[in-house]
Interface confidence: low
Amino acid sequence: SAPGEDEECGRVRDFVAKLANNTHQHVFDDLRGSVSLSWVGDSTGVILVLTTFHVPLVIMTFGQSKLYRSEDYGKNFKDITDLINNTFIRTEFGMAIGPENSGKVVLTAEVSGGSRGGRIFRSSDFAKNFVQTDLPFHPLTQMMYSPQNSDYLLALSTENGLWVSKNFGGKWEEIHKAVCLAKWGSDNTIFFTTYANGSCKADLGALELWRTSDLGKSFKTIGVKIYSFGLGGRFLFASVMADKDTTRRIHVSTDQGDTWSMAQLPSVGQEQFYSILAANDDMVFMHVDEPGDTGFGTIFTSDDRGIVYSKSLDRHLYTTTGGETDFTNVTSLRGVYITSVLSEDNSIQTMITFDQGGRWTHLRKPENSECDATAKNKNECSLHIHASYSISQKLNVPMAPLSEPNAVGIVIAHGSVGDAISVMVPDVYISDDGGYSWTKMLEGPHYYTILDSGGIIVAIEHSSRPINVIKFSTDEGQCWQTYTFTRDPIYFTGLASEPGARSMNISIWGFTESFLTSQWVSYTIDFKDILERNCEEKDYTAWLAHSTDPEDYEDGCILGYKEQFLRLRKSSVCQNGRDYVVTKQPSICLCSLEDFLCDFGYYRPENDSKCVEQPELKGHDLEFCLYGREEHLTTNGYRKIPGDKCQGGVNPVREVKDLKKKCTSNFLSPEKQNSKSN
C-alpha cells in the first residue's frame, strides 16, 4: 500500500463557506433533450455545450439545438447559437475537437433531404467564431483530424467516397471511391480499405488495403484479401483471408505496410474475431476469440516486432454480441491491466497483471470487507471489479474503473468481494498502490472523479431521486466530507471535469423538473480554496512502485526497472497545481530469464524459465514468416520483453539457429504490390 499517515480524519475547516463562495449555477434556457459537452484545448477553460431537442411531429421531426460556450471552466456560459446561424447540429457526429491545443472545432449540421451535400461549421479560435462551409458530399462519419497537422481532415461520404481537405475543411477533394474504412497513420499517411465488386459487406475478406502518403496524389496497394485492418502503436495489423478456406490470419507491418510478417497467432474462422486490446510502441495485447459463441477468448502479448506472441490469459471475457470486454489499462501505474475471465462455472472473475501481461492474478481482498454470498470460503475471496460488461448488463454500476497517469497509484472502481462478480449492489473501492491492495471507499454505487492530480476525489451517490449533495476527500478516499451545493435537488445526469485530472473545478450536470417544464442546469464548484496553499517538498513522500517484498533485492522491478515516486502525503491538504509533474526516479534492475520471452521456434516448459527449441514445427498451426517470403532468420531462442530495460545479470547466450527452413506464409507476394497514381 502507498504510504499512509494516521487513519484519523483530518477535517477541512470552514469548507462550507469556502465552497459556497466558489459554486456557480447556470440554468440553460432549454427544454430537456440531450446535452453534450466538450473541452476545447488543454488548460484553456473553454467548454462547448450542445443541447438538442427533438419534437416528434406527424410527418417529420423538428429539431432544435443550442450552442453554449464557457471560458472559465463552466462557471459561466454564453449562448453562441447565433454563431452557427441557429442551425440544428447533428449530435451523432458530436463536436470534432482538433488535436492538442489547435483550438479547432468542427460541427456537422443537419441539412434538408434534397441538398447536394452536407454543411459544417468550423472554428480555429477556440469557438469564438465559426465559418459555415457547404460540403460537396454528405458525411457518413465525423471529420477526422490528422494527428500531425490539424489542417488536414478526412471524412467518408454516404456514397463510400474518401474525401480529404488540406485547409481545415475549406475545400474538399474526393481522393478515392468505394472505401470502407479509413484511418490516419503517422506522418499524414492515410490507410484505407476498398471494395472492387459489390459493397463493403459483400467484399469482406476480399478487400484491398491501400496507402497514400501524399494526401491522395499517389497510392500503393499494400494488402489483398483483407478482412479488416487496425493501427496500434507503431504496428499496422491486417486480418487476411487464407487461400484454401474461410479462415483468416493476422499479419503485421512495422514499416507502414511495405513489408508484412505473419503473426504467430491462431487463425480464426468466420464467426470469430481478433481485437487489439491495447498497443504502444513496444508491444500489443491481442485478443483471439474462441471458436463458437463462447463469449471468451485468449489474450496474447507480442514481442517487439509484433510477430511472436506469448499466451497471456485464457478464457478472457469478450462477448461476441455486444462486443463488451472489461480490459482496462490502469494508467496510474506502469504495467498494470485489469480484465475479466469467464470461469468454467460461467461466473465472471476479475484478474490483474502488474507486469504487462506476464502473469495474472486475482485482486487481493480489501482489508475492511467481508466475503459475500458468492464465496465458498468466507475467509478467502477476492475483489471483483465491475467494468464495461457489468454496465452493459444494466447492473447498478454508473461508472467504469478510473485511473489517471498523474494521480500515481490511484485506481477507483465499483466492485464486489467474493468468488466472482456479484449482481448485488456494488460498493466503490480504491487502491492507492496501482491495484496491489484495495479498501472500500464508499458504500453503494457512486459517480467519481479525480481532481488536482489526486489531491481531491469527488463523488456523487448514484440515485434515482433528485440529489443536492456532493462528497469530497482530500486524503485519497480515507475520509469524506459532504457539501450541499443547492437547496433545490436536481435529477443528476453527470459529473464533468477537464480531462487530465489537473483541474480543481467540477461540474455537476442535471435537470430540474416542475409540473410544466424541465431545464438543464449545471453547478460548477471550484475547490481552490479548500486546497489553500501550494504543496511544498515536505508534503511529498517517497514511494517505491510495485513494492511487494522490501527484503527482496529486486523489489519493485517490473520490466527491468523500478521507479520511486514522490507522492502527496495523505495528510497534506495542498494544491499540486495545474503544472504538477510526476516526480519519479527510475533505477535499472539486473536481468534474469524472466526478462526474456521465447523467440519463434522456442517455448518454455511448465515451471521452467529456460526457452527450449520446439522439436518440429511442421504441421503447426502457428506458421511464421518474416516479410512474407523465405528469409534468413537467426535466433538464440530468447528475445528481450518489449519495453524491458534490465541490464547486466543474466544474458542468455546460446547457439544461433537458422530457422529459414521453417518459414512459410501465404500473404502478399511482391508482384501483387503495385503502385498507382492519380
Partner: antibody, heavy 129, light 107 residues
C-alpha cells in the same frame, strides 16, 4: 532454524578452479538473495557478488568479473560459487550470506537495507603449488 | 565504488567502558549501512542494519547512528564477549563494500 551449510575445505593448485556450495534451510530459498564474501588470512571482509535464486541473475564485484560464476539449484536450495584461474592470493575463507536486499543501479536507494543476517560457517580454500 | 573507511583501526577499552566506533563513506549511502561483529575463527554476525536498527537477538548496549556519510557504532558498556573485530558495510550502490574493520581489544 535458518541455516546455511557450506561444503568442506579445498586445496587447489594455481590456475585451477574451485566450486563451493552453500545449502540453505529453514526458510523459503527463493525469497532471499545470497551474497558471497571472502576473507584472506588476517585481512578484512571482501564482497564478491550476489545471486537472485529466483531467476538466477547475478551481479559481481569488478575485481572478480570473468573469474567468478554464481549459480543456484532451486530443487536442492543450494547456491554455488565457482572461482577459476586461482592464484595464491585467492587463499581465503569463503562465506555465503543471506542478503535480503540488493543493488539500486541508479537514483536514491529504493528502501532500507536489512544486512546479511545469516552466514554460512565458511569454506577454507587454499591455493598452493 | 564507494569506499568505506573505519577508525580507529584498533580501540583499547576496559570492560564496562563505552566504545565508539566510526565509519565514513566516500559518498552518501543514505541509511543503507550495516554493522557486523566477527570473533576469531567465526563467521561475521549482523549487529545493526538500516544504520540504526538492532538485528534480532542483539543486546541493547549496541546502538547505531548516522546517515549519509558519517556513521557510529556505540557499545555502551563493554562486556568480555564484545571484544572482537567490527565491520561496517554499505549497500547503497553496487558493489557492496566493507570498511577495513576496527579491532576492539581489552585495555
Amino acid at each position: 532454524q535458518v541455516q546455511l551449510v557450506q561444503s568442506g575445505a579445498e586445496v587447489k593448485k594455481p590456475g585451477a578452479s574451485v566450486k563451493v556450495s552453500c545449502k540453505a534451510s529453514g526458510y523459503t530459498f527463493t525469497s532471499r538473495y545470497m551474497s558471497w564474501v571472502r576473507q584472506a588470512p588476517g585481512q578484512g571482509l571482501e564482497w564478491m557478488g550476489i545471486i537472485n535464486p529466483v531467476g538466477g541473475s547475478t551481479s559481481y564485484a569488478q575485481k572478480f568479473q570473468g573469474r567468478v560464476t554464481m549459480t543456484r539449484d532451486t530443487s536442492t536450495s543450494t547456491v554455488y560459487m565457482e572461482l577459476s584461474s586461482l592464484r595464491s592470493e585467492d587463499t581465503a575463507v569463503y562465506y555465503c550470506a543471506r542478503d535480503p536486499s540488493g543493488i539500486a543501479a541508479a537514483g536514491p536507494a529504493s528502501r532500507y537495507y536489512y544486512g546479511m543476517d545469516v552466514w554460512g560457517q565458511g569454506t577454507t580454500v587454499t591455493v598452493s603449488s | 565504488e564507494i569506499v568505506m573507511t573505519q577508525s580507529p583501526a584498533t580501540l583499547s577499552v576496559s570492560p564496562g567502558e563505552r566504545a565508539t566506533l566510526s565509519c565514513r563513506a566516500s559518498q552518501s549511502v543514505s541509511s543503507n549501512l550495516a554493522w557486523y561483529q566477527q570473533k576469531p575463527g567465526q563467521a561475521p554476525r549482523l549487529l545493526i542494519y538500516g544504520a540504526s536498527t538492532r538485528a534480532t537477538g542483539i543486546p541493547a548496549r549496541f546502538s547505531g547512528s548516522g546517515s549519509g556519510t558519517e556513521f557510529t557504532l556505540t557499545i555502551s558498556s563493554l562486556q568480555s564477549e564484545d571484544f572482537a573485530v567490527y565491520y561496517c558495510q554499505q549497500a547503497r550502490l553496487g558493489p557492496w563494500t566493507f570498511g577495513g574493520g576496527t579491532k576492539v581489544e581489552i585495555k
